[in-house]
């Protein structure tokens, strides 16, 4: 059986919308503390042609800047291309659109790969019905509960949104 | 420790297919990632496949996507790898490999099969 789950059932379109970052994991815990590459939060998404745009929140300096990003569809419907700190192959890995989806990027920058996985909600209040989700994917991935970092509302830059 | 052993290599014509197995020793099978490595000759070792613990997800070398795919049986404690449209280029030895995380890197594998002789001619 091919593995990787697909993409929404009415298409990408319906990931478009807010969200918000609520749990991070990786390998390399550096990525992902305060002021690592992969400590970014994503404010809204919305899909064309098949890529997915995202507006995402890096703190910096004390204050968070928006920055938008493409990922670029691939012949694998949940697989797209993003650069980003280097190129990551962005696989989406469990997708509801209305409440949750998670997904998680193998990252290659110079010589050092990489393993992100990335929880986002549409409703903050809901956010502790989808961390089993994110750590059942982490797990299958290889990443342990002690490489999972849940996000507070100081960490998500909760200011900058408008 | 996991034990791996590799069958189902041989001689193919180029455009052929072939499919090549790995089965495990150890009851712990489903705690590894695994995935396939290919070495050809004069070169360096290099990522093919890869699948996770459940098979849920898989992660594939530009090289190979969408003519290679990969699966697991964990109740046969096997991983497959099944090679579709092969070019002679594909022609390599075929190594299986158990690591803790879904990665294209040899170093995040901790047990390696004797590998399986993969002659693609054209």
């Known amino acids: 059986q091919e593995g990787n789950h697909e993409e929404p059932q009415g298409g990408l379109e319906e990931l478009s919308g807010r969200w918000h970052s609520v749990a991070l994991a990786s390998n390399k815990s550096d990525l992902i503390k305060p002021w690592g590459h992969f400590r970014v939060f994503i404010h809204s998404m919305s899909a064309k042609d098949g890529n997915l745009h995202g507006d995402i929140l890096i703190p910096q300096d004390g204050q968070c800047e928006k920055v938008s990003l493409t990922a670029f569809k691939t012949a694998t419907s949940n697989k797209f291309d993003l650069e980003y700190w280097g190129h990551n192959d962005l696989y989406l890995a469990e997708v509801d659109p209305k409440s949750y989806l998670i997904l998680y990027m193998i990252n290659q920058y110079n010589d050092d790969t990489s393993l992100v996985a990335h929880l986002m909600v549409r409703d903050l209040s809901r956010q502790q019905d989808f961390l089993p989700a994110f750590e059942s994917v982490c797990e299958d991935i290889g990443l342990h509960k002690d490489q999972i970092v849940v996000l507070s509302d100081d960490d998500r830059c909760q200011g900058s949104r408008d | 420790q996991v034990q791996l052993v590799e069958s189902g290599g041989g001689l193919v014509q180029a455009g052929g297919s072939l499919g090549l197995s790995c089965a495990a020793s150890?009851?712990?099978?489903?705690?590894?990632?695994m995935g396939w490595f290919r070495q050809a000759p004069g070169k360096e070792r290099e990522f093919v496949a890869a699948?996770?613990?459940?098979?849920?997800?898989?992660h594939y070398a530009e090289a190979v996507q969408g003519r290679f795919t990969i699966s697991r049986d964990n109740a046969k404690i096997t991983v497959y790898l099944q090679m579709n449209s092969l070019k002679p280029e594909d022609t390599a030895v075929y190594y299986c490999?158990?690591?803790?995380?879904?990665?294209?890197?040899?170093?995040?594998?901790?047990?390696w099969g004797q590998g399986t002789q993969v002659t693609v001619s054209s």
């Open positions: 150890g009851r712990t099978f489903n705690n590894y990632v």
């Open positions: 699948i996770s613990r459940s098979g849920s997800f898989t």
């Open positions: 490999a158990a690591g803790a995380i879904l990665m294209p890197t040899e170093r995040t594998y901790d047990y």
